[in-house]
Interface confidence: medium
Amino acid sequence: GCLTQLYENAFFRGGDVASMYTPNAQYCQMRCTFHPRCLLFSFLPASSINDMEKRFGCFLKDSVTGTLPKVHRTGAVSGHSLKQCGHQISACHRDIYKGVDMRGVNFNVSKVSSVEECQKRCTSNIRCQFFSYATQTFHKAEYRNNCLLKYSPGGTPTAIKVLSNVESGFSLKPCALSEIGCHMNIFQHLAFSDVDVARVLTPDAFVCRTICTYHPNCLFFTFYTNVWKIESQRNVCLLKTSESGTPSSSTPQENTISGYSLLTCKRTLPEPCHSKIYPGVDFGGEELNVTFVKGVNVCQETCTKMIRCQFFTYSLLPEDCKEEKCKCFLRLSMDGSPTRIAYGTQGSSGYSLRLCNTGDNSVCTTKTSTRIVGGTNSSWGEWPWQVSLQVKLTAQRHLCGGSLIGHQWVLTAAHCFDGLPLQDVWRIYSGILNLSDITKDTPFSQIKEIIIHQNYKVSEGNHDIALIKLQAPLNYTEFQKPICLPSKGDTSTIYTNCWVTGWGFSKEKGEIQNILQKVNIPLVTNEECQKRYQDYKITQRMVCAGYKEGGKDACKGDSGGPLVCKHNGMWRLVGITSWGEGCARREQPGVYTKVAEYMDWILEKTQSSDGKAQMQSPA
């Protein structure tokens, strides 16, 4: 299953499959997730070790049992791969690291005015993997405002050094934010020239293309089909690069297929997994396990659930079957691809779906009428769970925010439906940043069911929570994916990095904003909050947030939207924007429904086959 917990001051001993330099534990975890054999990782921050060579060291590990002995090491951070973690799987990494220089091959230098501009240049350059930016206060005047675009053989820095007034980060191409655009065409009977960066076996050109997309140095590829004239080269997928970023030449060649990495696609990237099943094909590899199952789909599910399994073959040979069940061979290799592909067999083969973003249909949990005032513009994919709840009675308008918590579920505030409980009139827009981008052709979700908390009463602040079941499940993308929910009764976690987002008013008597706004707001204790709202009861099922001096807050139109906090590198939905006295007033914090207190209710409603059957009318 999916394990998200991080172990502080702990280091996994043994099991090493790769090592690299990464700026933090989260990036190390992402590299582990995408490494075909990595199940566990350990990271050494600069503060944890004196050995300069091991600072920022990221150690990727495998284990037959799925675990390794942990040894105490002050400052070290260890954890699990996010394989099998559905929507949490992403190669996108937005963080900017201050005081850190990520070293690599510097292939381009230019003067820019900000680190964001430097990151944008890297994202818009086909070969750039990461960058460093010297700020205006850098000690050498001639280097100030320099933006260095970089790459390395493995896609990670060749070294990371602590250096004042330098900021570093990664290309946002894996966030589907590149302005370059991509070539979707597949070219039949054409072979590309240039440098081979890797060679793997794949059953078709589409798997080859996906592998190229997620390989740090692949820009284009050539695939040799299973009828290619040289037997030893059949099903070979050659991952390629070139100085210019495009093939320098191409040769007409029977039974070859070529194409490009899709990493530079804007707004949508292919999933980092291969779901197709190949009948009449055997995949060879190291045997992990053999089990009897009924049907090839069950074989794929079995492979997906066994975290080390990379691909499988389901045999229909009479000697491999008994009654209705046949042998399911679960296999793996060093690079995650079959070591041999055979055609015309009585088997069917395919890959594990452990890296698919879709995950299951449940809501995301972890194992353990109110624009934002004082906020700033958000960027694409920054808050991919944020949705806009709009009403189309006559003119269409944004009324509330909401949070995507599963393929078919949105969490919002009950008061959004006061006087408008009709599911027909609502339209739910997800994966958007600007409200002005919504046209008559913009897809939206319709509501199948509105589930208002049974104890919510109109015009009262209590139990201000509602679930929306969508008519059809949504696919997850970099711009549209769910927020994880907190653990039930989560009271021990101290959240210090919390944000409220929405399109609501920018002042008390304002108007709905076009660009999604964000504001960083500190949580306030319930005791402190109660002092500020002596006419109301602040219950333990509420959470408050705001600055003593005011100036930053949620406001009308943000209601139902998320209050999210980042803890151990993971965002969680801590609150639902509910109410407050005015907006951003001094000593008047915003009041939010505390999601952790409603976990039983959320899970009951989302996991029951028919929420309606258990829905009670508001008491």
């Epitope: 006559t394 003119a395 046209t439 008559k440």
Partner: antibody
Framework: EVQLLESGGGLVQPGGSLRLSCAAS????????MHWVRQAPGKGLEWVSS????????TYADSVKGRFTISRDNSKNTLYLQMNSLRAEDTAVYYC??????????WGQGTTVTVSS | DIQMTQSPLSLSAFVGDRVTITCRAS??????LNWYQLKSGKAPKLLIY???SLQSGVPSRFSGSGSGTDFTLTITSLQPEDFATYYC?????????FGGGTKVETK
């Protein structure tokens, strides 16, 4: 092909009733807001009534409120207008129309209702 | 209710002429304004939605402009098939209301 086809019009006496139907084809009827619009002889277009996708919300022009009822059967891809207590001023060609976010993009050919003694 | 006032009531023009029809709303309707063409015995046809967006399949000689209260439909080069009655309609608030229509006749 996306199509709307009205039926049920005819001659009726004042105070009488009539039920108009509109059969939809070529699109997912259950996803669309639908309207009835009419045009009286020598006059302009007049919006009559609307119904939201699942039928849970309806709205009417003041001139027909309380007398006309709009409904739909999504399983049959059909829109209806039940017209009671008909008056001479209800004489018109009645059109059904499909709604997009902004306008009515698909219309039927119309069915004629004549209210006369 | 929002009143929609169309002008002129009718106009005569030659094939090839540039024709402009205006529509005024009694209050701000943003861009929730649509234009329709109606020929006798035929179904009305949506030409322009959202004040300025051309409905697919409609010739580019038709264009719409305006927002708030004042809107215009322009036919840049009138064709024989364009002789018809044109209606504006607001979809900003219920009741949806149409303008009185403008009949475009041949000179």
């Amino acid at each position: 092909e996306v199509q709307l086809l009205e039926s049920g019009g005819g001659l009726v006496q004042p105070g009488g009733s009539l039920r108009l139907s509109c059969a939809a084809s070529g699109f997912t009827f259950s996803l669309y807001l639908m309207h009835w619009v009419r045009q009286a002889p020598g006059k302009g277009l007049e919006w009559v009534s609307s119904i939201y996708s699942s039928g849970g919300f309806t709205t009417y022009a003041d001139s027909v409120k309380g007398r006309f009822t709009i409904s739909r059967d999504n399983s049959k891809n059909t829109l209806y207008l039940q017209m009671n207590s008909l008056r001479a001023e209800d004489t018109a060609v009645y059109y059904c129309a499909r709604d997009t976010d902004y306008g009515m993009d698909v219309w039927g050919q119309g069915t004629t209702v004549t209210v006369s003694s | 209710d929002i009143q929609m006032t169309q002008s002129p009531l009718s106009l005569s023009a030659f094939v090839g002429d540039r024709v402009t029809i205006t529509c005024r709303a009694s209050r701000d309707i943003s861009v929730y304004l649509n234009w329709y063409q109606l020929k006798s015995g035929k179904a009305p046809k949506l030409l322009i939605y959202g004040a300025s967006s051309l409905q697919s399949g409609v010739p580019s000689r038709f264009s719409g402009s305006g927002s708030g209260t004042d809107f215009t439909l322009t036919i840049t080069s009138l064709q024989p098939e364009d002789f018809a009655t044109y209606y504006c309609q607001q979809s900003y608030s219920i009741p949806f209301t149409f303008g009185g229509g403008t009949k475009v006749e041949t000179k």
